[in-house]
Interface confidence: low
């Protein structure tokens, strides 16, 4: 009790004249504080009942107080409706009138708020977004609602938070609470695991071509999780891309074009919340030479009785570094001419008259000859021969 007793000794005379010493105890009560003063800074916690959709206000006091008209049990005021004010008159025998009039400003219903993961899937490997959403209307003044988040040692007083530059595949715990007029009325905790990150870059060990139509690439896989590889190879403007099994560390490229530069790119990817591609490792090689294809549209035309004009079109596939056209002229099985030009345009003069010739034109790319295009053509008899005859009489 706040009242306290003081003991004092007094001497009085009795009627007989003898002195009698008696001890009396006098209670002196210093003034009690008013309940209004005593409970001026009382704090309240609100507890929500999801079944009844009503709140209980828990009064943070050390003694069991009385609540006037509102009954309170164990310092709890029950059955409070959301967003409605309730007035509670708080008294106790340790304080005097006037009582503390406490206005309970009841918060909105807890289920009207939902903690929502607002992380963009594209960025879910390194960011977390959390946001309180109002999913139903209420009549409370939204100005009086404040939000608080704590993620690790970071504290935010926002309705929405965005954490950036996080580690992929890591768990982060965030606690959050909502306060109404600075009274906490709901909280939530979320453990969020960031998404798989982009895989690292594969390490190409070698990438080469040792034949005209084949190449090979070998690599070490990246360290981080991934599902598959994509291998692309580009020749000139044509790009081929192939999905490869994650367990492969080597791929043989077939059906390549001879003497052609191929640029290869290899990246790993993972299909997580979205597909994430790792950085591509690049390399290139040039395939070996091969025989060129045949020249085409070859023509042999006579320019005189014993002269020919041989022409042809370039091969479709040169397949090598250089460009040279060859013409072989045979009579019977005897090679009578062997010419080489930059262009397929040959003028063959001074052949034998009235003779069958075989003309073989082919392309040489510096490494290989192509298949010859073969035409047969005969020279004429010498139409000018009669001018040279002398008649003797």
């Amino acid at each position: 009790s706040d009242a306290y007793l003081n003991a004092s000794e007094t001497t009085t005379l009795s009627p007989s004249g003898s002195a009698v010493i008696s001890t009396t105890t006098i209670a002196t009560t210093p003034s009690k504080p008013t309940c209004d003063e005593k409970y001026a800074n009382i704090t309240v916690d609100y507890l929500y009942n999801k079944e009844t959709k009503l709140f209980t206000a828990k009064l943070n006091v050390n003694e069991n107080v009385e609540c006037g008209n509102n009954t309170c049990t164990n310092n709890e005021v029950h059955n409070l409706t959301e967003c409605k004010n309730a007035s509670v008159s708080i008294s106790h025998n340790s304080c005097t009138a006037p009582d503390k009039t406490l206005i309970l400003d009841v918060p909105p219903g807890v289920e009207k708020f939902q903690l929502h993961d607002c992380t963009q899937v594209e960025k879910a490997d390194t960011t977390i977004c959390l946001k309180w959403k109002n999913i139903e209307t209420f009549t409370c003044d939204t100005q009086n609602i404040t939000y608080r988040f704590q993620c690790g040692n970071m504290i935010f007083d926002n309705k929405e938070i965005k954490l950036e530059n996080l580690e992929p595949e890591h768990e982060y715990k965030c606690d959050s609470e909502i306060l109404y007029n600075n009274h906490k009325f709901t909280n939530a905790s979320k453990i969020i695991k960031t998404d798989f990150g982009s895989p690292g870059e594969p390490q190409i060990i070698f990438c080469r071509s040792e034949a005209a139509h084949q190449g090979v690439i070998t690599w070490n896989p990246p360290q981080r999780s991934f599902h598959n590889f994509t291998l692309c190879y580009i020749k000139e403007t044509e790009k081929d891309c192939l999905n490869l099994d994650k367990n492969l560390i080597k791929y043989d490229l077939q059906n390549l074009k001879p003497y052609t530069k191929y640029v290869l790119s290899l990246h790993a990817y993972i299909i997580a919340k979205v597909q994430r591609n790792g950085s591509a490792a690049m390399c290139h090689f040039t395939t070996k030479s091969a025989p060129p294809s045949q020249v085409w549209n070859m023509t042999v035309s006579m320019t005189s009785d014993n002269s020919m004009h041989v022409k042809c079109r370039p091969p479709r596939d040169r397949n090598g570094p250089h460009e040279r056209y060859h013409l072989e002229v045979e009579a019977g099985n005897t090679l009578v001419r062997n010419e080489s030009h930059k262009n397929c345009d040959f003028r063959v003069k001074d052949l034998q008259y009235s003779t069958d010739y075989t003309f073989k034109a082919y392309f040489h790319n510096g490494d290989y000859p192509g298949e010859p295009f073969i035409l047969h053509h005969s020279t004429s008899y010498n139409s000018k021969a009669h001018h040279h005859h002398h008649h003797h009489h």
Epitope: D240, C241, L242
Partner: nanobody, 127 residues
Framework: QVQLQASGGGLVQAGGSLRLSCAAS????????MGWFRQAPGKEREFVAA????????YYGDSAQGRFTISRDNAKNTVYLQMNSLKSEDTAVYYC????????????????????WGQGTLVTVSS
């Protein structure tokens, strides 16, 4: 495992048209290149047409050039072959196939580059 179901074949007069469809089930083929091949009785299998994963690139064999059109609908997991100005030499069993290739040039003309094959649909062109 992917199952490919080709349909739309039948008997048609020379000069007529047909549209073949190939529906994939078992898994999505939206990231795969798709192709059509054909095999006439007693002949080698022949490349007809191919299309890359998103339809941006198409490839045609010599026989199909200018007359046939390949297309795809990734939402339906289906690839189509529209065949116009049909000739008797187009008579064959037409097969659709799915490749691991996402895009492809020369690679898509090679049957060996295709992983999954349909059961084929017969096209008969009468003169």
């Amino acid at each position: 495992q992917v199952q490919l179901q080709a349909s739309g074949g039948g008997l048609v007069q020379a000069g007529g048209s047909l549209r073949l469809s190939c529906a994939a089930s078992g898994r999505t083929v939206s990231s795969d290149a798709m192709g059509w091949f054909r095999q006439a009785p007693g002949k080698e299998r022949e490349f007809v047409a191919a299309i890359n994963w998103n339809g941006a690139s198409t490839y045609y064999g010599d026989s199909a050039q200018g007359r046939f059109t390949i297309s795809r609908d990734n939402a339906k997991n289906t690839v189509y072959l529209q065949m116009n100005s049909l000739k008797s030499e187009d008579t064959a069993v037409y097969y659709c196939a799915a490749s691991d290739w996402v895009v492809g040039g020369i690679s898509l003309m090679n049957g060996a580059e295709y992983k999954y094959w349909g059961q084929g649909t017969l096209v008969t062109v009468s003169s």
